[in-house]
């Protein structure tokens, strides 16, 4: 039996976009890829491997907000950004089966609902392959 | 013979947390985890695989302080912060079999020795699975 | 027939090292090992395979400038700084395939053409082995 | 509610030159990206010239370079254009109009103002 | 510099669909914006990134942007929707490029 060289199983990861985020809510989010590893549920990424993950986060707003990413109720907020125009920002989380990443936003105007955003990407990279998963 | 896909090797990737750094030494890390690839000993976090680490370092600090994270002697610091109350930062370093990560603090006041940590945390995940390792 | 556990082939990834920019024109960049997994060619980083890269750029400029890196023709930056000293920069972004990595330097000034850099440093790693490689 | 309101506009002869002030409200003006965008008579739409939020970032489009100077005074919530060597081709309304950083990856503009008609001729 | 090209005239029956074309050497790759701009009023945007609607704006404006051509949609024209359209898109190094504009009649 020949040998071939071991592959790579593929890494979760993946890219979502969003363009528009909404008051007292969150931003919706769009995978581009259909080849993404890791999936959109209800405006949330979900996680299926434990371990670490590197998240990218981007955008520039229409409108001064303040805007936190979750992964699980009751913590704290992976990222959490007060009254800016603009996110470019990077870091490091544990995360675990049953995580969903989502968005909430706040503005502060009571005279518009949606925001659009510009360049707006977030980007989850699994950093543990080999580790626990469950689909 | 049945071929199963790989599986990923586990990477070479530690969380540690401190709670509280001493004037003119380091910061007491411990890792909560008894599942890390990655050894602590001695207060300094043991590398054992050559390549670049994606570094992530965290921390709300009871006093200003000056802080590095170095990881080899006559080297420059892999972080190096001054007359701060906090750090959120993310860095890339190639490290190498037999190197060191440890803390080296200095506060600006005689009037106190240990400096209290709220969320202080430090993340080492490695980047170069296949390279050279010795344990 | 005995299985011996799979190891990981090499990862994509790469430091070069900039000593000097041209105004006008980029960065003169050098690869130091020669152990590298990716190449350099016409002061570009030839991409292959496709994927997440990680990105870390750093640098202490002699002259005030604007520096952008690139990918890709007709494309927005990797990063863009206007008018700064230096940079300590990281980044995720999706390349592929064909692309090439370069920077593109403006100064403010008549008077110089060469600027001298301190610690000039770029590093790409990429997060997603199994995925399209092309050589 | 954001308002963008221009003024400044005037009949003027080739050659002359002119201030154009655009006073911002409803919104933190320091935040944000501005630009003046021109539109002459029965015409379409032309990019002017663009300034970051600190203001130390400006760009300008061929036909202004050299000529026009984009300015902002974030403390008087106040965007200038100041248009010198004016030529008949310049004629036109002068809007400004908020937009993003021009390192973003593209770019739109999403509040306009109601424009102010400027007139070079002999 | 990029160069976009859309139809100075364009007629349509009321409550009919109105599709209004903007032309451009691989347009597909770049996001186009849309901006409708009524006799002696500024401009209003009213599609950005291909077709994302701002608030406010109604459903019957869409967008849709492949290959050489984008194009925008009005899926049941009022006469309220009598105006100039303008296509538009981001060039890193002619910035913010128009289009010619489009003038919709609304019969």
């Known amino acids: 039996l020949q040998q071939v060289p071991p592959q790579y199983p593929p890494i979760q990861s993946i890219r979502v976009q969003f363009t528009r985020c909404e008051n007292e809510k969150g931003c919706i989010i769009t995978s581009p890829s259909k080849d993404e590893t890791m999936k959109v549920q209800d405006n949330s990424i979900i996680i299926n491997c434990d371990g670490f993950y590197l998240i990218s986060l981007k955008g520039y707003f229409s409108e001064e907000l303040s805007l936190s990413l979750y992964y699980r109720k009751g913590r704290g907020p992976l990222f959490s950004l007060s009254k800016v125009t603009s996110v470019d920002s990077i870091g490091v989380a544990y995360l675990a089966f049953k995580d969903k990443v989502y968005f909430n936003v706040t503005t502060h105007s009571t005279s518009y609902k949606d925001i659009q955003v510009n360049g707006g990407e977030l980007i989850l990279i699994h950093q543990n392959p080999g580790g626990f998963c469950a689909y | 013979l049945q071929q199963v896909p790989p599986q990923y090797p586990p990477i070479q990737s530690i969380r540690v947390q401190f709670t509280r750094c001493e004037n003119e030494k380091g910061c007491i890390i411990t890792s909560p985890s008894k599942d890390e690839t990655m050894k602590v000993q001695d207060n300094s976090i043991i590398i054992n695989c050559d390549g670049f680490y994606l570094i992530s370092l965290k921390g709300y600090f009871s006093e200003e302080l000056s802080l590095s994270l170095y990881y080899r002697k006559g080297r420059g610091p892999l972080f190096s912060l001054s007359k701060v109350t906090s750090v959120d930062s993310i860095g890339v370093a190639y490290l190498a079999f037999k190197d060191k990560v440890y803390f080296n603090v200095t506060t600006h006041s005689t009037s106190y020795k240990d400096i209290q940590v709220n969320g202080g945390e430090l993340i080492l995940i490695h980047q170069n699975p296949g390279g050279f390792c010795a344990y | 027939l005995q299985q011996v556990p799979p190891q990981y082939p090499p990862i994509q990834s790469i430091r070069v090292q900039f000593t000097r920019c041209e105004n006008e024109k980029g960065c003169i960049i050098t690869s130091p090992s020669k152990d590298e997994t990716m190449k350099v060619q016409d002061n570009s980083i030839i991409i292959n395979c496709d994927g997440f890269y990680l990105i870390s750029l750093k640098g202490y400029f002699s002259e005030e400038l604007s520096l952008s890196l690139y990918y890709r023709k007709g494309r927005g930056p990797l990063f863009s700084l206007s008018k700064v000293t230096s940079v300590d920069s990281i980044g995720v972004a999706y390349l592929a395939f064909k692309d090439k990595v370069y920077f593109n330097v403006t100064t403010h000034s008549t008077s110089y053409k060469d600027i001298q850099v301190n610690g000039g440093e770029l590093i790409l790693i990429h997060q997603n082995p199994g995925g399209f490689c092309a050589y | 509610e954001v308002q963008l309101v221009e003024s400044g506009g005037d009949l003027m002869k080739p050659g002359g030159s002119l201030r154009l002030s655009c006073v911002a409200s409803g919104f933190t003006f320091s935040s944000f990206p501005m630009s003046w965008v021109r539109q002459a008579p029965g015409k379409g739409l032309q990019w002017v010239a663009y300034i970051h939020s600190g203001g130390s970032s400006t760009s300008y489009a061929d036909a202004v370079k050299g000529r026009f100077t984009i300015s902002r005074d974030n403390a008087k919530n106040t965007l200038y254009l100041q248009m010198n060597s004016l030529r008949a081709e310049d004629t036109a309304i002068y809007y400004c109009?908020?937009?993003?950083?021009?390192?973003?990856?593209?770019?739109?503009?999403?509040?306009w103002g109601q424009g102010t008609l400027v007139t070079v001729s002999s | 510099s990029y160069v976009l090209t859309q139809l100075p005239s364009k007629n349509v029956t009321l409550k009919q669909a109105a599709h209004i074309t903007c032309g451009g050497d691989n347009i597909g790759s770049k996001s186009v914006h849309w901006y409708q701009q009524k006799l002696g009023q500024a401009p209003v945007l009213i599609i950005y990134y291909d077709s994302s609607r701002p608030t406010g704006i109604p459903e019957r404006f869409s967008g849709a942007n492949s290959g050489n051509t984008a194009t925008l949609t009005i899926s049941g024209a009022l006469a309220e929707d009598e105006a100039d359209y303008y296509c538009?898109?981001?060039?890193?190094?002619?910035?913010?490029?128009f289009g010619e504009g489009t003038q919709l009649t609304v019969l």
């Open positions: 109009a908020r937009t993003f950083p021009t390192v973003a990856a593209d770019n739109w503009f999403y509040y």
């Open positions: 538009q898109v981001w060039d890193s190094s002619a910035k913010w490029v």
